[in-house]
């Protein structure tokens, strides 16, 4: 039907709040503008978190988005949630448009699930 | 015969490398002696990790293990984990046997996916 | 909510030109392709060209290749329709549109061509 | 480009009654099993408005009366019970290639 969207099932964040996983899409096409959109699943509401459109010249995206980042090649794009805490913990999914040119295809991975722990604070060095 | 065991399937280790989770059986019979068996899962292989044995005196188990602690109370036992690092994540499958007196009764959950993460060292303090 | 507005429309001579402006907003205009569509009175839709989100990608229907140009300024969330070489036959009203799952159309802009 | 037909190119009918329209396409519009045409219901002076996308696909806050159907080249928009407000002309439109191309129109009129 649309097109195959796939992202790892469970990613753990860093203790730092940083979160790394690809979304990968087949088939690929002949596309020149492709567009990502990172959604937060809670219960039977979707948010959107960020989104970028890339091409072959802008393969670095998300760059209005303090808290997200990626880089595209081919049929890959490896995103990367920062800034994350124990409650962001949750699914996140990777939407996948073929914006350009036409046909348009669209297609939604089944979503990754971020944990996240807060770390304990340091100690205060006196 | 077996009986039925339920234990949660994914749990975080805090940022200690401290995990906690239940382990419920049914039916819980009218058992002297209960013997709880942590066992890890990795590929095809099962180790276990710790093992004791619940009488109604001795509810408090796994003395024996500097790594497990558990509290038991009817047909519910409370199991902690520390000293987890982030190689230690994995399976943790809760064996649950009714030892004493007969009919002799075993049972084995699904398992708890636990994920650990470790933690940035704090910078020292000159 | 998504709207699509167009202006520049009115009375132009026959052979000038017209430059028509799309605005957008209600959504991340730099993200998606827009086309323009006109529709002559009493008569169908007409596809006219399409223009990619950043911009750096055209294509139009053969009948109107070589007298159109669409363009797109990103930073002022405004799409553009250039035509020349007017003839009475262009008289139709001009729509600007977001043409996905989800279809967003502007109210159509009227040129009449005309001496 | 891809010629899209529609059939009739006007009818008229009753409130209550069911209409069908027909669209036909010169190639298949499928593409890696979807099927990239839509329909459109334009009222006088107003802008097309989207009803069926991927030729089955209703649109958010369209009626359920309205469906479509097909795949390929032969395409169908029904409306089960016709409503005084649906009184409009319909398009089929294609989007598998540019140009995109939009069938000639059925205006459906009141008996």
């Known amino acids: 039907e649309a097109i195959q969207v796939t992202q790892p099932s469970v990613v753990l964040a860093s203790s730092h709040g940083v979160a790394s996983f690809p979304c990968e899409y087949s088939p690929s096409h002949n596309t020149d503008e492709v567009r990502v959109t990172v959604l937060r699943q809670t219960n039977d509401q979707m948010t959107e978190v960020c989104a970028t459109t890339f091409t072959e010249k802008n393969t670095v995206g998300f760059l209005d988005y303090p808290f997200c980042s990626g880089t595209f090649n081919e049929s890959r794009v490896n995103l990367t949630i920062q800034g994350l805490r124990a409650v962001d913990t949750g699914l996140y999914l990777c939407k996948v448009e073929l914006m350009y040119p036409p046909p348009y295809f669209v297609g939604m991975g089944n979503g990754t699930q971020i944990y996240v722990i807060d770390p304990e604070p340091c100690p205060d060095s006196d | 015969e077996a009986i039925q065991v339920t234990q949660p399937s994914v749990v975080l280790a805090s940022s200690h490398g401290v995990a906690s989770f239940p382990c419920e059986y049914s039916p819980s019979h009218n058992t002297d002696e209960v013997r709880v068996t942590v066992l890890r899962q990795t590929n095809d292989q099962m180790t276990e990790v710790c093992a004791t044995t619940f009488t109604e005196k001795n509810t408090v188990g796994f003395l024996d293990y500097p790594f497990c602690s558990g509290t038991f109370n009817e047909s519910r036992v409370n199991l902690t984990i520390q000293g987890l690092r982030a190689v230690d994540t994995g399976l943790y499958l809760c064996k649950v046997e009714l030892m004493y007196p007969p009919p002799y009764f075993v049972g084995m959950g699904n398992g708890t996916q636990i994920y650990v993460i470790d933690p940035e060292p704090c910078p020292d303090s000159d | 909510e998504v709207q699509l507005v167009e202006s520049g429309g009115g009375l132009v001579q026959p052979g000038g030109s017209l430059r028509l402006s799309c605005a957008a907003s209600?959504?991340?205009?730099?993200?998606?392709?827009i086309h323009w569509v006109r529709q002559a009175p009493g008569k169908g839709l007409e596809w006219i060209g399409i223009?990619?989100?950043?911009?750096?990608?055209?294509k139009y229907a053969q009948k109107f290749q070589g007298r159109v140009t669409i363009s797109r300024d990103n930073s002022k969330n405004t799409l553009y329709l250039q035509l020349n070489s007017l003839r009475a036959e262009d008289t139709a009203v001009y729509y600007c549109?977001?043409?996905?799952?989800?279809?967003?159309w502007g109210q159509g802009t009227l040129v009449t061509v005309s001496s | 480009d891809i010629q899209l037909t529609q059939s009739p190119s006007s009818l008229s009918a009753s409130v209550g009654d069911r209409v069908t329209i027909t669209c036909r396409a010169s190639q298949s519009v499928d593409f890696h099993g979807k099927s990239f045409l839509h329909w459109y219901q334009q009222k006088p002076g107003k802008a097309p408005k989207l009803l069926i996308y991927d030729a089955s696909s209703l649109e958010s806050g369209v009626p359920s009366r309205f469906s479509g159907s097909g795949s390929g080249t032969d395409f169908t928009l029904t409306i089960s019970s016709l409503q005084p407000e649906d009184f409009a002309t319909y398009y089929c439109?294609?989007?598998?290639?540019?140009?995109?191309?939009f069938g000639q129109g059925t205006k459906v009129e009141i008996k």
């Open positions: 439109e294609q989007s598998l290639e540019v140009p995109f191309t």
């Open positions: 223009i990619s989100p950043s911009g750096g990608g055209t």
């Open positions: 549109a977001r043409l996905y799952d989800v279809a967003y």
């Open positions: 209600g959504y991340t205009f730099s993200g998606y392709a």
